[in-house]
Each structure stands twice: as C-alpha cells, then as structure tokens.
C-alpha cells in the first residue's frame, strides 16, 4: 500500500543554472488531487524549494515567484528548477502526496543529486 517515488540519482545543471528531472510515482489509489513538493536536503537539514498542487489531467502550476516549473502526465511529473548556482549543489527530494480522495498517501523519493557549476566569466576582449 505504500507509495513508491522514483527519481534520477544524479543530474547536472546546465551552464545557465537550469536542472530538469522526472519524478514518477506508483499510485496505490486513484487520486484526483496531487501535491508535489521539491525539498533540498543539506547536512540533515531539509528545506522546501517549491510546491504545487494539481488536479489529475490538469497542468502543474507553481507560484509566480517560484524557481520551479513543471508538467504532469499521468503519474509522472517533469520538474525544472532554474536560477541555480554552484552553492545550490545538493540533494533534491521529490515528495508526492495524494490529497484527494481519501485515503491520503505520502511518497518520498531517494533524492536527485544536482550538481551546479558556475560558468567561467568571459575574458575581456580588446
């Protein structure tokens, strides 16, 4: 009855500080309302990066000021995190909650290690 969440082990952010990964969950029930949260774990401290609740069949909508965007297709969510810098390198955990109808289910992925390398500044040209 537990809900399994799968996500890639490692992702390398682009030179523009954008990282994308897929979060897939095996739903034990037929949920119509799902909440997806991206958590960052560093030194056993867990913080929320972004969260969105969506109705199955509808688009995933994060808040306007969120650094995350995403799309959903069935039990799969494509997540994109932007504005990343080297200091943001860390473990990003996908958390999925089946909110409605009851019963509630919680699913937590093992995390995706996102590596971010700040681009070298362009040398001045004469």
């Amino acid at each position: 009855k537990a809900m399994h969440v799968a996500q890639p082990a490692v992702v390398l952010a682009s030179s523009r500080g954008i990282a994308s990964f897929v979060c897939e969950y095996a739903s034990p029930g037929k949920a119509t309302e799902v909440r997806v949260t991206v958590l960052r774990q560093a030194d056993s401290q867990v913080t929320e990066v972004c969260a969105a609740t969506y109705m199955m069949g509808n688009e995933l909508t994060f808040l306007d000021d969120s650094i995350c965007t995403g799309t959903s297709s069935g039990n799969q969510v494509n997540l994109t995190i932007q504005g990343l810098r080297a200091m943001d390198t860390g473990l990003y955990i996908c958390k999925v909650e089946l909110m409605y109808p009851p019963p509630y289910y919680l699913g937590i992925g093992n995390g995706t290690q996102i590596y971010v390398i700040d681009p070298e500044p362009c040398p001045d040209s004469d």
């Epitope: 867990v46 909110m99 289910y105 937590i108």
Partner: antibody, heavy 118, light 108 residues
Framework: QVQLVESGGGVVQPGRSLRLSCAAS????????VHWVRQAPGKGLEWVSV????????FYADSVKGRFTISRDNSKNTLYLQMNSLRAEDTAVYFC???????????WGRGTMVTVSS | EIVLTQSPGTLSLSPGERATLSCRAS???????LAWYQQKPGQAPRLLIY???SRATGIPDRFSGSGSGTDFTLTISRLEPEDFAVYYC?????????FGQGTKVEIK
C-alpha cells in the same frame, strides 16, 4: 524559536462542545500539515485529525468523524479543533503536532487537557 | 488501517544496558514512513527517529533505528538515566496515521 502552544481545554459535560486552539510560531505555518493527537489518562497516543497546507484537505480518525472539525487560519498561524457531541471517551490530553517536511511529527505542543464528565 | 504492535509492553533494564524495542506492522510499511518517539511522564512526545533509521535533530547516537517491511527495531545502545520513558512507533505513509501501543522502559 519553533513552537506550538495549545489552549481551550477544560471540563465539559457529555454532549456539549469545546474548541481547542494551537498557536504556531517560528516557522512558515502554511507550508506544513498540522495534526491533533490525543492521549487518554494512562493510555497511548491516538491520532485524531490533520489539516494540510491551505486547509482544503482534512482527514479524521473514525472515532471522531462527524463530531470533530479541524480548521486553520494561516493568517493567524493558528490551528483549531471544534469538538461537538463530546463523550466520556474523549477525555484526554490533546496535543497539536507539526508534520515535518519528510512526514514525521517533529514539533509538539505541551498539550491541553479535556475532561468530559457529568 | 495499519496496526502497529509493539513488544515487549515493559522492558526492565539497568543503566548501561542495551535496550531493543520491537514494532511490527499488520501490513508492509515503507521504511521511509516509520518513526519512533520518546515520551516522559507529563511531557509531550519527542521525535527520535524518522524514516526508520534517521536520527532527528539533537538525538544522541546511542539511539538507532532499523528494519523494513513489517518489522522495525529501536535500539538504545547504552541506557542513560534519562532514557527511562515510554517509546512509541508510528507510521505516517498513509491515513489514518497510527501509533503502536507503546513500550515502557523502566529501571530494574
């Protein structure tokens, strides 16, 4: 610091109502599910209810379904439990607890005692 | 509903001894969603272990959790005087959230 403080407990007759409150501070209240857990005298812990995030999703134990109503005011960082048609078996210390980002109950209030007796 | 059964009901040990507490689930529980709490008389419960084996912030390393499926264990490697209390396991992977009935660790 991060804390939860319950209030509103007391002695009430069977069939009457009571409303408990839980004031949260030190964290972004709306980012967390918040639970009520109770403990009858000399007994173990019993989960009662939870309200998630914006307050649209609520779940109840079968023992209180239809009698208790959980709610929250995110602008006031406060959780509530409206208890109607109280019974002697509802006598307990009622704790509010925060559901951590990874799910376990990481922050607990000190509890408020509810006694249902004629 | 997932029923959690703890054993033994009471554990009588001396300071310095090792305590092993068991929690058995009526159906499989992912280890990600199993927690242990400590409660002393007149106090609120305190989170010790989450995800079956991860220590909560500020919890001494003499406390450790293990297990998977339906069988989980909390181990206190060397009992300190302040460890004598009641311990509860809990599953939080699905509603209703459920607790075990508790194991009391008392001084022998």
């Amino acid at each position: 610091q991060v804390q939860l403080v319950e209030s509103g407990g007391g002695v009430v007759q069977p069939g009457r109502s009571l409303r408990l409150s839980c004031a949260a501070s030190g964290f972004t209240f709306s980012s967390y599910g918040v639970h009520w857990v109770r403990q009858a005298p000399g007994k173990g812990l019993e989960w009662v209810s939870v309200i998630l995030y914006d307050g649209n999703n609520k779940f109840y134990a079968d023992s209180v379904k239809g009698r208790f109503t959980i709610s929250r005011d995110n602008s006031k960082n406060t959780l509530y439990l409206q208890m109607n048609s109280l019974r002697a078996e509802d006598t307990a210390v009622y704790f509010c607890a925060r559901g951590a980002l990874l799910g376990a109950f990481d922050i607990w209030g000190r509890g408020t005692m509810v006694t249902v007796s004629s | 509903e997932i029923v959690l059964t703890q054993s033994p009901g009471t554990l009588s040990l001396s300071p310095g001894e090792r305590a092993t507490l068991s929690c058995r689930a009526s159906q499989s529980v992912s280890s990600s969603y199993l927690a242990w709490y400590q409660q002393k008389p007149g106090q609120a419960p305190r989170l010790l272990i989450y995800g079956a084996s991860s220590r909560a912030t500020g919890i001494p390393d003499r406390f450790s959790g293990s297990g998977s499926g339906t069988d989980f264990t909390l181990t206190i490697s060397r009992l300190e005087p302040e460890d004598f209390a009641v311990y509860y396991c809990q599953q939080y992977g699905s509603s209703p959230w459920t607790f075990g009935q508790g194991t009391k660790v008392e001084i022998k």
